[in-house]
Amino acid sequence: LNTTILTPNGNEDTTADFFLTTMPTDSLSVSTLPLPEVQCFVFNVEYMNCTWNSSSEPQPTNLTLHYWYKNSDNDKVQKCSHYLFSEEITSGCQLQKKEIHLYQTFVVQLQDPREPRRQATQMLKLQNLVIPWAPENLTLHKLSESQLELNWNNRFLNHCLEHLVQYRTDWDHSWTEQSVDYRHKFSLPSVDGQKRYTFRVRSRFNPLCGSAQHWSEWSHPIHWGSNTSKENPFLFALEA
């Protein structure tokens, strides 16, 4: 199973292959190569992938991952039971739904099994790392001669999501966008019947249940107007 590793975001300090840690003089720790950062995403609260850049290691190394939850009934250290691989080297760990506890501090530890003192421990707030599936079943209703309403569904608790609707006509060079709260419906009050419109939606786990920064993928687009409006002036649903 190959995985795609998200690339760094241009921080100039991360370009070096390694650094020597400069610890206070009374430290017992030895200078060691740093381990790669672990990045976790919770996909629709169905599973979680925690990945790292295995190619940042000076030589191919099967790093191991352990995790636990701080101050909870789930504070027992767990070994990763489902590793992800990149070119036959461990590059991530996949956790299943029963192992995900959104509102407890998630602690993840990466370790070099050949040098056990070489380890890095991170803490994560999983509720800020949720990425929902893209919205589905987009439908358009003509409420009046000039007003359209767009509806969609999410495979998740609807009140936890905010949405971003984008639309444009065939005459537009760019999208117009509108934020929508958990109600997952959007009205366009003034529609030009001579134009063909395209709509799409994406969703985010924010702000009621978490503070995620990452949006879902865009939905499949749905179109209205021009030819399609003649077929059924009152309803047009996306055909997958």
Epitope: S29, E37, Q122, M123, N128
Partner: nanobody, 126 residues
Framework: QVQLVESGGGLVQAGGSLRLSCAAS????????MGWFRQAPGKEREYVAI???????FYADSVEGRFTFSRDNAKNEVYLQMNSLQPEDTAVYYC????????????????????WGQGTQVTVSS
Amino acid sequence: QVQLVESGGGLVQAGGSLRLSCAASGRTLSRYAMGWFRQAPGKEREYVAIDSWGGDTFYADSVEGRFTFSRDNAKNEVYLQMNSLQPEDTAVYYCAGAPTSFATTAYSSSNSYRYWGQGTQVTVSS
């Protein structure tokens, strides 16, 4: 290179407050994971408060609800507000920083930090 300099330590009575500051020079901290650690005589260094540059902050159990981490990227400084201090809080307090690629990275392991200050002594008398 980043230089970190702590200040604000001192002697305080139990129940009192102190505010530690950590000033950075040489590079902006806006994309650094930062941490406050402490080391009491004869004990291992332990994390007190850690923070990702995305704003996720975590505290050690022993200080939760009493200590508050904050950062001011414009001033290139981080702070540790310490309230309701107890004798067990007596230690040398260190500020540490690590450049990170991801906004969510917060390290509780001291060996993950690249840069360290020289430390500031905090003594809480009973």
